[in-house]
């Protein structure tokens, strides 16, 4: 028997459904009788779903897997994981066995969309050019990590006093607070760009000062 | 209509600098960024940096950083790179190109027509 | 930096007939890429960007498709002036990257 998984990761969203796919070639004659089908964690070797001697024998892993049944006689050896969470990712092993065995791997890589930043400014009056600044940008819930990026208003990367921190919340989701301190020209563009590298999800903010007064500018 | 005009050719000494220049007209100068991009037979193009023609901050790929100076003079709406320590290896062709788009996602809709840089003793 | 690879380096085609460029990113640029034409005696011209968009004043025969890591050029029905060298560049972070140029010569 020759098991055949997807070779790229399986990228889901937190709290949404992943299938996990796998599958074999069954001979002709082939009862669900015959077969042996685990998934388990590739690394611990935690069962997670199996269906042995003919029957489903239900999921071992927080009871939200499934199988396909009615696809298995077909060599669907799929797996449905309910409710994506963090804690969800890595490696899962499909072993089929039949008269022979064979096992492959794959991966899952859960993520989640950042929401659009949050911008605030200190001080945020009496600003005149030459004085120092603190623009925070904030965004909340996303997974994995993000990249942050601070451009002006031409698109040229501000990389002077930037801290940026990324705290995990009880969930595993990230909040990211990053801090440019600057010193104010005339007017200008402050702009922080939070990108998922999963998602290839960008979200931004802006703030502009253009002499008086401060202004927040709405989405392109 | 929207225009670059590049400074001529150049025939320099190895070891000395070079400083050529890229004027914009036919629009607000200082509302583009402007891009310094080299054109070399052995590397094809190569982004050597960007330039905010308004605040002059300034950003440059790591290769260049320490051989290029960008600069810009609003007054003349005029971009100026400098080349520092020059070798045979900074002989190219050197253009300038507006920076057009939305944040964060910046082209080059308008390119100078390049200056010529030759190295040789 | 990210690598841009372009495909073919030379390419021969006759007025009229369709041709495509390729170009292959290192990793995944989501759909910002940008398609250059390079002729001699002209200054560099942006016929797309953002991976599909047709630049203002770009004739319809110019299209571009692809995301992610793989992109397509297509000049439907070439017409003499399209006899040219093409670049791809992304323009998805910095330090912006340029694919090493397709020669399309007159068959």
């Known amino acids: 028997v020759e098991v055949q998984v997807s070779e790229d990761p399986v990228v889901a969203l937190v709290d949404t459904d992943a299938t996990l796919r796998c599958s074999f070639s069954p001979e002709p004659g082939f009862s669900l009788a015959q077969l042996n089908l685990i998934w388990q964690l590739t690394d611990t070797k935690q069962l997670v779903h199996s269906f042995t001697e003919g029957r489903d024998q239900g999921s071992a892993y927080s009871n939200r897997t499934a199988l396909f049944p009615d696809l298995l006689v077909q060599g669907n050896a799929s797996l449905r994981l309910q409710r994506v969470r963090v804690t969800d990712e890595g490696s899962y092993t499909c072993f089929v066995s039949i008269q022979d065995f064979d096992s492959a791997a794959v991966s899952l890589q859960v993520a989640a969309p950042y929401s659009k930043p949050s911008m605030t400014l200190e001080p945020n009056k009496d600003l005149r050019p030459g004085n120092m600044v603190t623009i925070t940008c904030s965004s909340y819930q996303g997974y994995p990590e993000a990249e942050v990026f601070w451009k002006d208003g031409q698109g040229v990367p501000l990389t002077g006093n930037v801290t940026t921190s990324q705290m995990a919340n009880e969930r595993g989701l990230f909040d990211v607070h990053s801090v440019l301190r600057v010193v104010l020209g005339a007017n200008g563009t402050y702009s922080c760009l939070v990108r998922n590298p999963v998602l290839q999800q960008d979200a931004h903010g802006s703030v502009t000062i253009t002499g008086q007064p401060l202004t927040f500018p709405p989405e392109a | 209509e929207v225009q670059l005009q590049q400074s001529g050719p150049e025939l320099v000494r190895p070891g000395v600098s070079v400083k050529i220049s890229c004027k914009g007209s036919?629009?607000?100068?200082?509302?583009?960024?402007m891009h310094w991009v080299k054109q070399s037979h052995a590397k094809s193009l190569e982004w050597i940096g960007v330039?905010?023609?308004?605040?002059?901050?300034?950003y440059y790929s790591q290769k260049f950083k320490g051989k290029a100076t960008m600069t810009v003079d609003k007054s003349s709406s005029t971009a100026y790179m400098e080349l520092a320590r020059l070798t045979s290896e900074d002989s190219a062709i050197y253009y300038c190109a507006r920076g057009a788009g939305y944040f964060p996602y910046w082209y080059f809709d308008v390119w100078g027509a390049g200056t010529t840089v030759t190295v040789s003793s | 930096d990210i690598q841009m690879i372009q495909s073919p380096s030379y390419l021969a085609a006759s007025p009229g007939e369709t041709i495509t460029i390729n170009c292959r990113a290192s990793?995944?640029?989501?759909?910002?890429l940008a398609w250059y034409q390079e002729k001699p005696g002209k200054t560099n011209k942006l016929l797309i960007y953002s991976g599909s968009t047709l630049q203002s004043g770009i004739p319809s025969r110019f299209s571009g498709s692809g995301s992610g890591t793989d992109f397509t050029l297509t000049i439907s029905s070439l017409e003499p002036e399209d006899f040219a060298m093409y670049y791809c560049?992304?323009?998805?972070?910095?330090?912006?990257?340029f694919g090493g140029g397709t020669k399309l010569e007159i068959k």
């Open positions: 330039i905010n023609t308004y605040s002059g901050n300034t």
């Open positions: 990793k995944s640029i989501s759909k910002y």
């Open positions: 036919g629009y607000t100068f200082t509302d583009y960024a």
């Open positions: 560049q992304q323009h998805y972070e910095y330090p912006y990257t």
